[in-house]
């Protein structure tokens, strides 16, 4: 076993240099010291070590810093960042935006989205701010990474970043994330008016409350069915037929094709059939006429 072998006499290196390229793997395991590697990380990146040798160096560094690499080393990682896993990164404490931007440059075009996202999350956890420069440094990575951040990390994301989010970016977001992002989007777009406001905010409407949707229905927005389907069920079921009619405008006809799918189906179940009939779309599934709906969600008021 490589771990058990002793370093041969005269083979102990005092600096990182090209001689190490010619060491057998077991010699690197036996002879190289993690603290020396950490001190001379720039040289590790300059010399053409094999990937196997680099993975031995990583093993050495991991043993030297079991609690995660110190920021002084992280700043020097350069191309070595490519050999670090997202799990490693989660142990780090990164406070310098320059460190983040440098490492994001290294990861660009390297199939390293997971590492890049973990790095930014780690920076946010340390109280850093995700500015637009950093989002640009994240480059082509879809902003769906916002959904990977913890809700606490999301608080650190400035509202201005919401301008860069596209509809597909939020597909995998939890309800809690959508709620937080919606609040940020409202604040980002507060000075935008009319239809332009709706165009921007509609990406985030999955986080909107019933109150917000009611307000929106007063503005002739003609919401398309795709956006409607992304609304959270809890908010949607609180809207009346008249309010949904105002919200969708001419797109109300598209409800028919979605009547057996959530969230449209859930909304239909909560409406009186007579109100649905007035739409003239042949929508079924409403509360039959003459039935009384008891909402057990308010029973606490009587206990």
């Amino acid at each position: 076993d490589a771990e058990q072998k002793a370093c041969p006499p005269g083979k102990e290196p005092y600096k990182v240099d090209e001689d190490l390229i010619f060491y057998q793997n077991w010699e690197l395991e036996a002879c190289v010291d993690g603290t020396m590697l950490a001190r001379q990380m720039d040289l590790v990146n300059e010399i053409p070590f094999t990937y196997e040798q680099l993975s031995i160096f990583k093993h050495k560094l991991d043993k030297t810093y079991p609690q995660g690499y110190p920021e002084s080393l992280i700043q020097q990682l350069g191309h070595f960042f490519r050999y670090v896993s997202p799990e490693d990164i989660h142990q780090w404490n990164v406070t310098s935006p320059d460190t983040v931007k440098t490492l994001l440059k290294v990861s660009k075009g390297q199939k390293m989205n997971a590492q890049a996202i973990a790095l930014v999350a780690c920076y946010l956890r340390g109280g850093g701010q995700l500015d637009e420069d950093m989002v640009k440094a994240l480059g082509d990575i879809p902003l769906s990474y916002l959904c990977d951040f913890s809700p606490q990390d999301l608080h650190s994301v400035p509202s201005s970043v919401m301008w860069l989010v596209g509809p597909q970016d939020l597909d995998k977001c939890s309800q809690r994330h959508l709620g937080l992002l919606y609040q940020k989007a409202c604040s980002a777009f507060q000075n935008v008016s009319g239809l332009e406001y709706f165009e921007k905010i509609k990406t985030f409407l999955g986080g909107a409350s019933v109150k917000d949707l009611r307000a929106l229905s007063q503005h002739n927005v003609s919401m398309d069915i795709a956006t409607f389907k992304r609304l959270q069920v809890d908010s949607l079921v609180g809207l009346s037929v008249a309010e949904v009619q105002k919200l969708l405008g001419p797109n109300i006809v598209d409800l028919k094709t979605e009547e057996d799918k959530s969230p449209v189906r859930d909304w239909l179940f909560r409406q009186h059939q007579k109100d649905l009939d007035r739409l003239g779309l042949g929508l079924q599934g409403g509360i039959p006429n003459g039935y009384l709906v008891l909402d057990f969600n308010v029973r606490e008021a009587f206990s």
């Epitope: 053409p48 094999t50 990937y51 196997e52 490519r82 050999y83 075009g109 390297q110 199939k111």
Partner: nanobody
Framework: QVQLVESGGGVVQAGGSLTLSCAAS????????MRWYRQAPGTERDLVAV??????YYADAVKGRFTISRDNSKNTLYLQMNSLRAEDTAVYYC???????????WGQGTLVTVSS
């Protein structure tokens, strides 16, 4: 993927010369470093020489006798071996690694026999 094919091995007298070639094909644009290794019977595979950009590196045993070079237009790596000795007898392997995928590629090896 990168494919590597070595050629040029054979039997040579001690003190003679030989040039090994390694033709690379496939995703050659992504190659980071190229190397020659050798393995004598019953021993570990040893690194002989490396070319990385315009820098070259040699094992002590071959310094001053072997020269590694690369012709990018032909996607070919060379190892010019002069003043050959009996202890240079081995199977010589060409190796390349690529950027991004962090993968290693090997040729099938070519046998060099130095007779004294």
């Amino acid at each position: 993927q990168v494919q590597l094919v070595e050629s040029g091995g054979g039997v040579v007298q001690a003190g003679g010369s030989l040039t090994l070639s390694c033709a690379a094909s496939g995703s050659t644009f992504s190659i980071r470093a190229m190397r020659w290794y050798r393995q004598a019977p019953g021993t570990e595979r040893d690194l002989v020489a490396v070319i990385y950009g315009s820098s070259t590196y040699y094992a002590d045993a071959v310094k001053g006798r072997f020269t590694i070079s690369r012709d990018n237009s032909k996607n070919t790596l060379y190892l010019q071996m002069n003043s050959l000795r009996a202890e240079d007898t081995a199977v010589y392997y060409c190796n390349a690694d690529t950027i991004g995928t962090a993968r290693d590629y090997w040729g099938q090896g070519t046998l060099v026999t130095v007779s004294s």
